[in-house]
């Protein structure tokens, strides 16, 4: 999960090692421009926030699907 609260600022210092179940993910956002490491934060149905690597294909696929919806 990102460190800090967002807003104001949440940053990710590691990424989830496993692919999240597609139907668990309800929203996403890029971490702040103040963060040293690029990351996408996925928000789950249960209200959890999970850090993911934006260069991973599954992350981009989920972002694309969420954007369409």
């Amino acid at each position: 999960a990102p460190m800090g609260s967002d807003p104001p600022t949440a940053c990710c210092f590691s990424y989830t090692a496993r692919k999240l179940p597609h139907n668990f993910v309800v929203d996403y956002y890029e971490t702040s421009s103040l963060c040293s490491q690029p990351a996408v934060v996925f928000q789950t149905k249960r209200g959890k926030q999970v850090c993911a690597d934006p260069s991973e294909s599954w992350v981009q696929e989920y972002v694309y699907d969420l954007e369409l919806n």
Epitope: P8, T9, Y29, E30, S32, S33, L34, S36, P38
Partner: antibody, heavy 115, light 107 residues
């Protein structure tokens, strides 16, 4: 579809300031950072900085600190870049772009600083 | 800051040629290396993201490879519509930086 709309041109006098806009549509504005890039024939593409519309956080290239101020207005899905104390060196094309991969770009605003 | 060095500065090509454009980083940028094409009086357009990932709507003749500090954009059969400037860019660390570009022109 995703669009970033920028005015085509701005003509400003030396010493003045200018505030450029970048209106986003076709996606959730708060999900992506907006980046600003300067292009001049001599210098190529230069990253100015980025703003996070979600919370207003900004990150600047050291070279543009004090020159550029980045903001975002969620209500209008618009990002802004203000450039101050303009000189002829600031004459360039300025682009806004979306996200880490800069997958969408505005058409660019041509800034001319001239008396 | 990460310095990206592109070579050659200019590449003269004949339609049908296979060409390779190089981008070298002064330090590792991991997988966060992207390629853009810019035609005269147009905005840059994303061609390849994250070293080698293709972009919807971009012809399959464009491909990317490399890792760490050494990256290559390949065009396997150049067409006249491919003429223009090509830039690499890293988004691994702030400030994001661009290479100076490679100009693709007709021989």
């Amino acid at each position: 579809q995703v669009q970033l709309q920028q005015p085509g041109a701005e003509l400003v006098k030396p010493g003045a300031s200018v505030k450029m806009s970048c209106k986003a549509s076709g996606y959730t504005f708060t999900s992506y950072n907006i980046h600003w890039v300067k292009q001049t024939p001599g210098q190529g593409l230069e990253w100015i900085g980025a703003v996070s519309p979600r919370n207003g956080d900004t990150s600047y290239n050291q070279r543009f600190k004090g020159k550029a101020t980045l903001t975002a207005d969620i209500s209008s899905s618009t990002a802004y870049m203000q450039l101050s104390s303009l000189t002829s060196e600031d004459s360039a094309v300025y682009y806004c772009a979306r996200g880490y991969g800069y997958d969408y770009w505005g058409q660019g605003t041509t800034l001319t600083v001239s008396s | 800051d990460v310095v990206l060095t592109q070579s050659p500065a200019t590449l003269s090509v004949t339609p049908g040629d296979r060409v390779s454009l190089s981008c070298r980083a002064s330090q590792s940028v991991s997988k966060y290396l992207h390629w853009y094409q810019q035609k005269s009086h147009e905005s840059p357009r994303l061609l390849i993201k994250y070293v080698s990932q293709s972009i919807s709507g971009i012809p399959s003749r464009f491909s990317g490879s490399g890792s760490g500090t050494d990256f290559t954009l390949s065009i396997n059969s150049v067409e006249t519509e491919d003429l223009g400037m090509y830039f690499c860019q890293q988004s691994n660390s702030w400030p994001h930086t661009f290479g100076a570009g490679t100009k693709l022109e007709l021989k």
